[in-house]
């Protein structure tokens, strides 16, 4: 997290806000609900209280405007700048302005007013942008999904550094951004994508360019807004420029940033039995056109060319790949080796000699 220079903050805990005007995109009650909910994000974790005024001067004046709207920080038409807010202080201090050339919504369409407002009110209270891609105060808008919003830990630490904690946090679970060099790090899924490596963990993935040590961290939804926050497995089919992503009983086919029509599909359409609730890991072999799908202690082999599950499967993981354990969290193939991830450990398995040749920490893939 980051606070503004000179640690700008309010010297009182009871703050007022006023909605000066409304966007035509939403009903008045939807707008009011979004702002109320956005203030609650911050009051839940601090001693701050927010009271709405219907007229007069409030600490935080909220308005919608377009282009030059009276503060010498003009908006720019659709997309680009969405909103801005001033840090704590008199006059403009704390005020939040929303660009009415955007389409404001209470869903995933356009820009979600609650999410943008919660971010802007962070500025109104004294938080600057965060470098943590998982933080609400990260400067890039990402719709985080329909489920109950949980303020990330980075934002909690930031706001509490200014105002201290509240009496009782109604949602004490604050998601932390994974630390790639945590020795206990386990991974959810790994796939190549157009020459890069994507390493998934929780609602994030690291994007590793070849010949590069520093992996970039992204929210999965910043790449693919329609995907679930967390995924179970992934593999690339390079000759078709597709990657396949699995979550629970569903899977998606993606071409770059775009989901193919007709997806998601059910994993049972691949020929997996109905009892299989999820795929834990998947890896594709371009030379044979086969894909290994792991679930529980079993492995299936899918023929991607003929779109059929191979006979004699499922088989036990321990029988086909002795020594790697009875489950696979994530897997990828490179230069004739399969890399199996099981908890905080990865096994380098030689396809040619059919045996484990190295055991390494899982996060050595991230150069830790």
């Amino acid at each position: 997290y980051n606070v503004f220079p000179r640690t700008l903050k309010w010297s009182k805990m009871n703050l007022t806000y006023r909605i000066v005007n409304y966007t035509p995109d939403m009903t008045h009650s939807e707008v009011e609900k979004a702002f109320k909910k956005a203030f609650k994000v911050w009051s839940d974790v601090t001693p701050l209280n927010f009271t709405r005024l219907h007229d007069g001067i409030a600490d935080i004046m909220i308005s919608f405007g377009i282009k030059e709207h009276g503060d010498f920080y003009p908006f720019d038409g659709p997309s680009g700048l969405l909103a801005h807010a001033f840090p704590p202080g008199p006059n403009y201090g704390g005020d939040a302005h929303f660009d009415d050339d955007e389409t404001w919504t209470s869903s995933s369409k356009g820009y979600n007013l609650f999410l943008v407002a919660a971010h802007e009110f962070g500025h109104s209270l004294g938080l600057d942008h965060s470098k943590d891609p998982g933080a609400l105060m990260f400067p890039i808008y990402t719709y985080t999904g329909k489920s109950h919003f949980m303020l990330p830990d980075d934002d909690v630490q930031g706001i509490q550094s200014l105002y201290g904690p509240g009496d009782e946090d109604p949602n004490p679970k604050h998601p932390k951004t994974p630390d790639k060099c945590d020795p206990s790090l386990s991974l959810d899924a790994i796939t190549s994508l157009r020459g890069e490596t994507m390493i998934f963990k929780d609602r994030f993935f690291w994007r590793l360019h070849p010949q590069q040590v520093d992996a970039e961290l992204f929210l999965t939804k910043s790449f693919w807004p329609e995907l679930p926050n967390r995924i179970d497995a992934a593999y690339e089919h390079p000759s078709h420029d597709l990657i396949f992503i699995f979550r629970g009983r569903k899977f998606w086919a993606l071409n770059g940033y775009d989901i193919l029509e007709g997806y998601p599909k059910k994993i049972s359409e691949l020929g997996l039995p109905k009892e299989v609730k999820k795929i834990s890991a998947a890896v594709h072999f371009e030379d044979t056109g086969k894909t290994l799908l792991f679930s529980g202690n079993q492995v299936w082999r899918y023929d991607d060319t003929n779109h059929i599950m191979d006979k004699d499967y499922p088989r036990l993981i321990e029988e086909d790949f002795p020594g790697i354990g009875d489950k696979v969290d994530a897997v990828y193939e490179k230069n004739g080796y399969i890399y199996f991830f099981n908890g905080p450990i990865q096994f380098e398995y030689s396809i040619w000699s059919n045996r484990i040749v190295r055991v390494m920490p899982a996060n050595s893939i991230l150069w830790c």
């Epitope: 659709p78 997309s79 071409n255 775009d258």
Partner: nanobody, 114 residues
């Protein structure tokens, strides 16, 4: 419905630069990812670069560090800045919106001679 028209192709010496443009008609351009693909004579069409709705970029390994993709949603235009061109970059370059099942331009020819 989105119509795409590429321009900016031409002949250039190895080491030179070109800037391809992709003009989109239809107001929905900003809702789609924007990608460039290319097809060299006798070869399969291949991905070159992509930019998401949220302006996250992605490049083929062969062009990373030399090519830069960008978009201007207000103008409805996408761009591909190509520097340090090599003979193997010779191909017809196609603009795409929305991926393989999306919208395609007719292409613009880029020829790089040594």
């Amino acid at each position: 419905e989105v119509q795409l028209v590429e321009s900016g192709g031409g002949s250039v010496q190895a080491g030179g630069s070109l800037r391809l443009s992709c003009a989109a008609s239809g107001s929905t351009f900003s809702r789609y990812s924007m990608n460039w693909y290319r097809q060299a004579p006798g070869k399969q069409r291949e991905f070159v670069a992509g930019i998401s709705v949220g302006r996250i970029t992605n490049y083929a390994v062969s062009v990373r560090g030399r090519f830069t993709i960008s978009r201007d949603n207000a103008e409805g235009t996408g761009y591909l800045q190509m520097n340090s061109l090599k003979p193997e970059d010779t191909a017809v370059y196609y603009c795409n919106a929305g991926g393989l099942q999306g919208y395609w331009g007719l292409g613009t020819l880029v020829t790089v001679s040594s």
